[in-house]
């Protein structure tokens, strides 16, 4: 589909650079051919990244803000293209490339899971919640008995270093816990984390990574969960988790246990009660959880299971017998 | 209640320099990220920088990078700007503002009643 | 440039409804991004009004109300008063900015007598 031609000779970018311009990310900046003659014509770019990850788009700008881990280094490449006649003619490629970081592999950490939660906020008289942010990871099998590890996160423009760490047996950071972020619980960016370490011995490779709010947000469970029996009907109410997220955006799992016969029943619902018909010779235990709908982010976690809540007569009534 | 004063400005040359200030009282400055919005004569607002509540992470706005700095001293529940290279076009009003982010896009809920800072020769 | 877009002005009568809009784009609000709203009374410094879309601080009136939709929100005001006479930012989120903070350029909103 790319067709030389010769009466339009296109020339591929000037200038191309990678420049670093935050955690797990990056700017890449060209300048059109000096020596292209075409001027008049609407000439695009094509920007290919060969690594990490594969991936190409077009743009008419002459610069491209990308999201991405750098530990492995980084790789691309822009042309110059021009639509023309149903065709596309393209320029031979300009490349640029970061090198991965120093370090041996296995001196960086490994399992890096992060988590984030939303908690009542004692200061905001506005917005009542705060969210907070807690990753672990293990130490990498290669590094030094010395080496120290240190966390940085990224949210949008905001990059803050740890201050709050959990140590092994050997005083090695191996976990961190931000109690208050500038993570947008209800937004839409990559929560990018960096875990970087130093030893006298060697250098310690940094490790990157990025995460999707919705896949790692922990979800509290539903509030004030009541249940109660009236005759052959149990009645379950509750009030939506401590989040950011409003009213209508839940998707609610209520469990009902049947403590005499061991049945359970596990209901999905959009609303904030249940009405289930029983047998009132049971006792019962309920529980409710709760999941952001996909109405409102993308499919995420379930919460843990609310506290159980006991109803019903507590003596076991032999079944009748005929 | 919380309380936002701003002082410092002044007039001063192209290419001077001048540091705001802004004291807080009401409410626990060390818990809460600040911010420096201005307001240019007759014109709208303009979001200038912000700072982390423990004053080590900073943002600024593509027009004031390299030349204004955004500090705090949280001992004096003290938020200040270090303004270098001024330029005619950095003639405003310049209020202080908490940050507020929690979980969202962030707002500045209270407000000083700004100090005048005008660059001219 | 990127930026949240106001009419400059709107005027309207004691008593009577007026809205004032904030148009955006796909990189602030057309991506979900919350939506907040200040007034600005002549000679003193501006005043959280609306946050997150259609949130009142305490203190502020319910004739104020706001509202989003695609890529714009607007600010509802009923019964119109003489001291809602002000000037009116709206203010949002843009991830194709180094700060992420955008305002509106304001609206001036003028009580008729």
């Known amino acids: 589909d790319l067709l030389p031609d010769d009466k339009i000779s296109l020339l591929p970018p000037v200038n191309f650079t990678i420049k670093v311009t935050g955690l797990a990310q990056v700017l890449l900046r060209w300048e059109p051919n000096p020596d292209q003659e075409q001027r008049n014509v609407n000439l695009e770019y094509q920007v290919k990244i060969n690594a990490p990850k594969e991936d190409d788009y077009e743009t008419r700008i002459t610069e491209s803000k990308c999201v991405t881990i750098l530990h492995k280094g980084f790789s691309a490449s822009v042309r110059t293209i021009l639509q023309k006649d149903h065709s596309l003619l393209a320029s031979s490629w300009a490349s640029a490339e970061l090198h991965a970081p120093p370090g041996s592999p296995g001196t960086s950490v490994v399992n890096l899971t992060c988590t984030t939660n939303t908690t009542a906020d004692n200061y905001s008289y506005l917005r009542p919640y705060q969210v907070s942010l807690h990753c672990t990871w293990l130490v990498g099998t290669d590094a030094p008995e010395d080496t120290q590890y240190f966390l940085y996160y990224r949210y949008g423009s905001w990059t803050e270093e740890c201050q709050e760490y959990s140590k092994d047996s050997m005083g090695r950071n191996i976990a961190c816990w931000f109690p208050r972020t500038f993570i947008h619980s209800r937004g839409r960016d990559w929560l990018a984390v960096l875990v970087n370490g130093s030893s006298k011995h060697s250098a310690i490779k940094p490790f990157d990574q990025l995460f999707a709010l919705h896949a790692i947000d922990q979800i509290n469970p539903p509030l004030n969960v009541t249940a109660e029996i009236k005759g052959t009907r149990l009645s379950i109410q509750w009030e939506k988790p401590v989040s950011a997220f409003p009213i209508h955006c839940f998707d609610y799992e209520v469990k009902i246990h049947n403590a005499r016969n061991g049945y359970l029943q596990i209901e999905k619902m959009m609303t904030n009660a249940f009405i289930s018909i029983i047998d009132d010779l049971s006792k019962y235990d309920v529980q409710v959880r709760a999941a952001v709908s996909s109405m409102c982010r993308e499919a995420g976690l379930w919460s843990e299971w609310s506290q159980p809540i006991y109803v019903g007569k507590d003596e076991h009534k032999p079944l009748r017998q005929w | 209640q919380v309380q936002l004063q701003e002082s410092g400005g002044g007039l001063v040359q192209p290419g001077g320099s001048l540091r705001l200030s802004c004291a807080a009282s009401?409410?626990?400055?060390?818990?809460?990220?600040m911010s420096w919005v201005r307001q240019a004569p007759g014109k709208g607002l303009e979001w200038v920088s912000a700072?982390?509540?423990?004053?080590?992470?900073?943002n600024y706005a593509d027009s004031v990078k390299g030349r204004f700095t955004i500090s705090r001293d949280n001992a004096k529940n003290t938020l200040y700007l270090q303004m270098n290279s001024l330029r005619a076009e950095d003639t405003a009003v310049y209020y202080c503002?908490?940050?507020?982010?929690?979980?969202?896009?962030?707002?500045?809920?209270?407000w000083g009643q700004g100090t005048m800072v005008t660059v001219s020769s | 440039q990127a930026g949240l877009t106001q009419p400059p002005s709107v005027s309207a009568a004691p008593g009577q409804r007026v809205t004032i809009s904030c148009s955006g784009s796909?990189?602030?609000?057309?991506?979900?991004?919350?939506v907040h709203w200040y007034q600005q009374v002549p000679g003193t410094a501006p005043k959280l009004l609306i946050f997150?879309?259609?949130n009142r601080p305490s203190g502020v009136p319910d004739r104020f109300s706001g509202s989003k939709s695609g890529t714009s929100a607007s600010l509802a005001i009923t019964g119109l008063q003489a001291e809602d006479e002000a000037d009116y930012y709206c203010?949002?989120?843009?991830?194709?900015?180094?700060?992420?903070?955008?305002f509106g350029g304001g609206t001036k909103l003028t009580v008729l007598r």
């Open positions: 700072i982390n509540s423990g004053g080590k992470s900073t």
């Open positions: 503002a908490d940050y507020a982010t929690n979980y969202g896009v962030p707002y500045f809920g209270s």
């Open positions: 009401g409410f626990t400055f060390s818990n809460y990220a």
């Open positions: 203010q949002s989120y843009d991830s194709s900015l180094s700060g992420h903070v955008v």
């Open positions: 796909r990189s602030n609000i057309g991506s979900g991004y919350d």
């Open positions: 997150d879309d259609n």
